[in-house]
């Protein structure tokens, strides 16, 4: 028979997206065994009838990857899950409704951080997504996100930072003392989304000026 | 050397629909964003519309939404503006523009629409 | 929409005069301001991008400052070829939008 309450068996399912990968995940509840299983459904907000997600039928992890089966930007989704313990009881949880670019977050940004004599150059690798374009490409977030920007700090000393910012991929803080330590942190912004990745981190000494010498 | 050529311009009644095309060369068409921005006579630049070239992804201002359409041919190298249900005030010189590393420093010559009866 | 609002919209000067222009943005775009010169009969073209850097092959004459909310675009010593109408536009979030214009003219 079914239990009382579903969370009972099964609780806290939801989608956690980072970058368009798009995890289902759940927890099992207090009454939750590991010899539990859980199946996956999906479907796309609008449609009638759930699809059975292969790879995610009775299994005992607690996570199954719907990034292909929810990879339309412009669609919602829903996923559910049913557990089934091994006693026969089951209860099913729907996760809320599910958009890539409402609710995926930004990972830091590959960067490349290149040091000379008084100046340091940051270079940004666009992010791939797993998001095919129609000739087969994979998607970067800036093909995703037209008002993406890139924000950049140089910690120069306790007291001062300098910032640079915008939606070239190539950067360089000049006025630099030679051979000295500096921490740069480089985000990903979307102002529209209200998106902002962790940042990169890169400790680079300026090279000695060897011109004294 | 980055060229932006449009076309398709011309007079139009009213109510009436009109294709510009915009050819583009030297550069990568295919991973890039593409801009139709107009100008009515006299009076000042508006963004009209954008394209990723890869994803597909558009946005529109306010004012022509669910009436023009921004696409491409990423194998003719060519954008293209689908303007349906015309209006006087759509009366401007359209021109396509892009973006590349970073920055919206290339724009066509301009072709004029002329919405009137 | 963010709203920029420009001024003046025209002005007259003389030639080697300091010419300065403002634009005020609606709401933050933090440095997110290009400055563009458009001529009678051409399409617009880039001179400032992100507040302050300048494109290439444009004069140094030409300098931009601001952020946040409030921004300059200042021509050091107006020349003959500087007679134009010129725009700021934001490009923090779409729509772009376009400041009204200030035409500079020869007094």
């Known amino acids: 028979h079914a239990p009382e309450d579903p969370s009972d068996l099964l609780q806290h399912v939801k989608f956690q997206s980072s970058n368009f990968e798009n995890i289902l995940t759940w927890d099992s509840g207090p009454e939750g065994t590991p010899d539990t299983v859980y199946s996956i459904e999906y479907k796309t907000y609008g449609e009638r009838d759930w699809v059975a997600k292969k790879g995610c039928q009775r299994i005992t992890r607690k996570s199954c990857n719907l990034t292909v089966e929810t990879g339309n930007l412009t669609e919602l989704y829903y996923a559910r899950v049913t557990a089934v313990s091994a006693g026969g009881r089951s209860a099913t949880k729907m996760t809320d409704r599910f958009s890539s670019l409402q609710h995926t977050t930004l990972k830091p940004p590959d960067v490349t951080c290149i040091s000379k004599v008084r100046s340091i150059q940051m270079i940004v690798h666009p992010t791939p997504t797993p998001i095919r374009a129609g000739d087969g490409h994979r998607l970067t977030l800036e093909d995703i996100f037209h008002d993406l920007f890139y924000h950049l700090e140089l910690q120069v000393n306790r007291t001062y930072q300098m910032h640079l910012g915008g939606k070239q991929r190539e950067y360089e803080f000049f006025g630099l003392t030679p051979d000295t330590e500096f921490l740069g942190t480089i985000m990903i912004c979307v102002p529209t989304w209200a998106k902002e990745s962790a940042p990169y981190m890169c400790r680079v000494k300026t090279l000695p000026d060897r011109t004294w010498t | 050397e980055v060229q932006l050529v449009e076309s398709g311009g011309g007079l139009v009644q009213p109510g009436g629909s009109l294709r510009l095309s915009c050819a583009a060369s030297?550069?990568?068409?295919?991973?890039?964003?593409m801009y139709w921005v107009r100008q009515a006579p006299g009076k000042g630049l508006e963004f009209v519309s954008v394209?990723?070239?890869?994803?597909?992804?558009?946005h529109y201002v306010e004012s022509v939404k669910g009436r023009f359409t921004i696409s491409t041919d990423n194998a003719k190298n060519t954008l293209f503006l689908q303007m349906n249900s015309l209006k006087s005030e759509d009366t401007a010189v359209y021109y396509c523009?892009?973006?590349?590393?970073?920055?919206?420093?290339?724009w066509g010559q301009g072709t004029q629409v002329t919405v009137s009866s | 929409d963010i709203v920029m609002t420009q001024s003046p919209s025209s002005l007259s000067a003389s030639l080697g005069d300091r010419v300065t222009i403002t634009c005020q943005a609606s709401?933050?775009?933090?440095?997110?301001i290009d400055w563009y010169q458009q001529k009678p009969g051409q399409a617009p073209k880039l001179l400032i991008y992100?507040?302050?850097r300048l494109e290439t092959g444009v004069p140094s004459r030409f300098s931009g400052t601001g952020s946040g909310t409030s921004f300059t675009l200042t021509i050091s010593g107006v020349e003959a070829e500087d007679l134009a109408t010129y725009y700021c536009?934001?490009?923090?979030?779409?729509?772009?939008?376009f400041g009204q214009g200030t035409k500079v003219e020869l007094k």
């Open positions: 523009a892009t973006r590349i590393q970073g920055l919206i420093d290339y």
């Open positions: 030297g550069f990568t068409f295919s991973s890039s964003w």
């Open positions: 394209i990723n070239t890869r994803s597909g992804i558009t």
């Open positions: 709401q933050s775009i933090r440095s997110f």
């Open positions: 992100g507040t302050s």
């Open positions: 536009l934001q490009d923090y979030s779409w729509p772009l939008t």
